[in-house]
């Protein structure tokens, strides 16, 4: 069964900067990745970025830079403007879509005890969807 992993880390050099890393473990090619915060895509989450493997990326504030790391993983840099966007308490979700086979989504957040720069992966919450 395909799986999605999500890892959130605070940058050691800038405490207001966070990076979300997401990856897809499974066969097949990815046609679109959606990153949201505050909940899963389609369930009240707010979209931060969408990435297409050929056509590029789109992002919305407070997302700063979305990019592909490999053919099956992405990263999204975020700029925390302060109290208005408390990333440390926020859930980030990544959905990997493979049209028309299906889509797979998982969520994660910054580990509560994590020090800046450490990137201990949280326990992912898989949200599986069969389209």
């Amino acid at each position: 069964t395909p799986e999605v992993w999500v890892q959130v880390q605070m940058e050691a050099t800038e405490l207001s900067s966070f990076t979300v890393h997401c990856g897809f473990l499974g066969p097949g090619s990815i046609s679109l990745v959606t990153v949201s915060w505050g909940g899963p895509d389609g369930a009240g989450g707010t979209k931060l970025a969408v990435l297409h493997p050929e056509l590029g990326t789109r992002q919305w504030a407070p997302a700063r830079q979305a990019r592909w790391e490999t053919q099956s993983s992405i990263s999204l840099a975020l700029e925390d403007s302060g109290a208005s966007s408390p990333f440390a308490n926020t859930t980030f979700c990544c959905k990997f879509a493979s049209f028309p086979e299906g889509s797979w989504e998982s969520c994660g957040s910054l580990p509560p005890s994590s020090d800046p720069g450490l990137s201990a992966p949280p326990t992912p919450v898989p949200i599986l969807r069969a389209d």
Epitope: S31, L32, K47, K95
Partner: nanobody, 121 residues
């Protein structure tokens, strides 16, 4: 969660017509487009038609003048009127919501189970 349910597929003779419907429900915030894709047996999927958030319909060249896409916002529904059907239109048709990266393509983010259209005499 976004749910898209297609209906209206079936068997039709060449030159005939069909109207596909898609009932949409759920949260579709920050999507740019809604449309129809199709996948013929043994072939790659292709975007057939979509409507931008500004209401402009766009079509792949092979269906221009034959297919018409429309929306009913009150019913949260999308339609595809298919006229002058050809054997090469035989495919599973999927209703999709997605994002625009260029003018002509609606990248699917959510889609339905699909409805089969068979054009044969």
């Amino acid at each position: 969660e976004v749910q898209l349910v297609e209906s209206g597929g079936g068997l039709v003779q060449p030159g005939g017509s069909l109207r596909l419907s898609c009932a949409a429900s759920g949260y579709t915030s920050r999507t740019d487009c809604m449309g129809w894709f199709r996948q013929a047996p043994g072939k790659e999927h292709e975007g057939v038609a979509h409507i931008d958030s500004d209401g402009i319909p766009r079509y792949v060249d092979s269906v221009k003048g034959r297919f018409t896409i429309s929306q009913d916002h009150a019913k949260n529904s999308l339609y595809l009127q298919m006229n002058s059907l050809r054997a090469e239109d035989t495919a599973v048709y999927y209703c999709v919501v997605g994002f625009k990266f260029d003018e002509d393509y609606c990248a699917p983010n959510d889609w339905g189970q699909g409805t089969m259209v068979t054009v044969s005499s």
